[in-house]
Amino acid sequence: GELETSDVVTVVLGQDAKLPCFYRGDSGEQVGQVAWARVDAGEGAQELALLHSKYGLHVSPAYEGRVEQPPPPRNPLDGSVLLRNAVQADEGEYECRVSTFPAGSFQARLRLRVLVPPLPSLNPGPALEEGQGLTLAASCTAEGSPAPSVTWDTEVKGTTSSRSFKHSRSAAVTSEFHLVPSRSMNGQPLTCVVSHPGLLQDQRITHILHVSFLAEASVRGLEDQNLWHIGREGAMLKCLSEGQPPPSYNWTRLDGPLPSGVRVDGDTLGFPPLTTEHSGIYVCHVSNEFSSRDSQVTVDVLDPQEDSGKQVDLVSAS
């Protein structure tokens, strides 16, 4: 007869490991007992369990409650055992020693490999601002056994660098993603992808990029000069800009206070029926935590009874 086992048994942390040991005997041969031991190099054999044809299963105190026989029906020639709830410390060499009648004793070894799936974490880098050079966008760390693979999935152009730290029974891998911040990256996903044999599918952690910027400001509403005449209703100026974080708007009049009746509504300045009092220089001040911008326009309210043309100056300042 001969023993059938596996060279390597691989399980994921917390799963049950089946340690196979089957005696393929000739007709009439019987298995008296199967002794299981852990036999790591440099250490003495440590009893795991004994399966006896008459006495049943004996489990070593060190493994009490963790070793069982596979569920029935059981073949009397099958000396396999289940090691419940495998932990990293269970990884190593195991030996089954089978006593048969009349053929004598046989032994076989296997290696138990316990996969420890990683629990990845993603850490964003410092705040990204337009105009910076190459900057850390995020780092992703995953520790497991064996070492996990850490990659990035994104449309954003950047560079990656990885480093690995080996521990006694695992390895930690950290990958960093660097980029040159630009406003086009705003809202773009940056995904850390962790692969590992202990995972059914890759683990993905997505970070949305936020790049601080503030665009030049401009004012709209004075495109048709003829509309700015005495008595006109619904006249308005709108300040145009964009930024991250979203900017706030403030309107002032350079040559005095805002005329009565003029309404400020965020980026919009609304006028009552126009009078010559509304002529003047108006300033839109745009700001966010990153920067601030100004844009100013000159409003000249015309009297339709006058023949002279309307003069408009547009000045933009930063």
Partner: antibody
């Protein structure tokens, strides 16, 4: 036929010492783990000590640990129990018994027993 | 240590009676249980090993059953020579421990 014969029992004062022997015949002595079991007058059976076939890995009941020493001479097919610092509560019939070592620290039931030797500890 | 609890501690029966003695272990011991018979002034004699296996030379009226924590010794038809004290013993762990014994007396 397998025979186990104990000797060395007797009357001893508290604090005294005694050495029990168990001579085995009729089978291969070195194949078996041996143990001592005692029975106080009118009481039940109490395991005292055990020893591997090779003579190592000695085990003791808490009640005798540090006072009793088990040993064997495989060349003489003999088991011993050295008893020191004897107490009145050690008074009992001492039996030697054999069992087969299955693996590690796992044994069969004890299939053969000696007739016993009486140890009396009294002043 | 594993505690072995035997019951009853004594019983009276007549020749031909069916006698049952139970033994409970404080924790699972698979089938690492033996039953011994002891007569006054004599050494214990192995009757049953591995919970249910009959030792060579022991009459078939003796039988054992059970596994784990609960075990039973049955004498199907009590004979005059069966009046004695019976002990169960676990040898799953060291120290091996015995039940307190069951004395079977003539009614």
């Amino acid at each position: 036929e397998v025979q186990l014969v104990e000797s060395g029992g007797g009357l001893v004062q508290p604090g005294g010492s005694l050495r029990l022997s168990c001579a085995a015949s009729g089978d291969i002595f070195t194949n078996y783990s041996m143990s001592w079991v005692r029975q106080a007058p009118g009481k039940g059976l109490e395991w005292v000590s055990g020893i591997y076939p090779s003579g190592d890995n000695n085990r003791y009941a808490d009640s005798v640990k540090g006072r009793f020493t088990i040993s064997r001479d495989n060349s003489k097919n003999t088991l011993y129990l050295q008893m020191n610092s004897l107490r009145a509560e050690d008074t009992a019939v001492y039996y030697c018994a054999r069992a087969e070592l299955l693996a590690f620290d796992v044994y069969t039931a004890s299939d053969y027993w000696g007739q016993g030797t009486l140890v009396t500890v009294s002043s | 240590d594993i505690q072995m609890t035997q019951s009853p501690s004594s019983l009276s029966a007549s020749v031909g009676d069916r006698v049952t003695i139970t033994c409970r272990a404080s924790q699972g011991i698979s089938s690492y249980l033996a039953w011994y018979q002891q007569k006054p002034g004599k050494a214990p004699k192995l009757l049953i090993y591995a919970a249910s296996s009959l030792q060579s030379g022991v009459p078939s009226r003796f039988s054992g059953s059970g596994s784990g924590t609960d075990f039973t010794l049955t004498i199907s038809s009590l004979q005059p020579e069966d009046f004695a004290t019976y002990y169960c013993q676990q040898h799953y762990t060291t120290p091996p421990t015995f039940g307190q014994g069951t004395k079977v007396e003539i009614k």
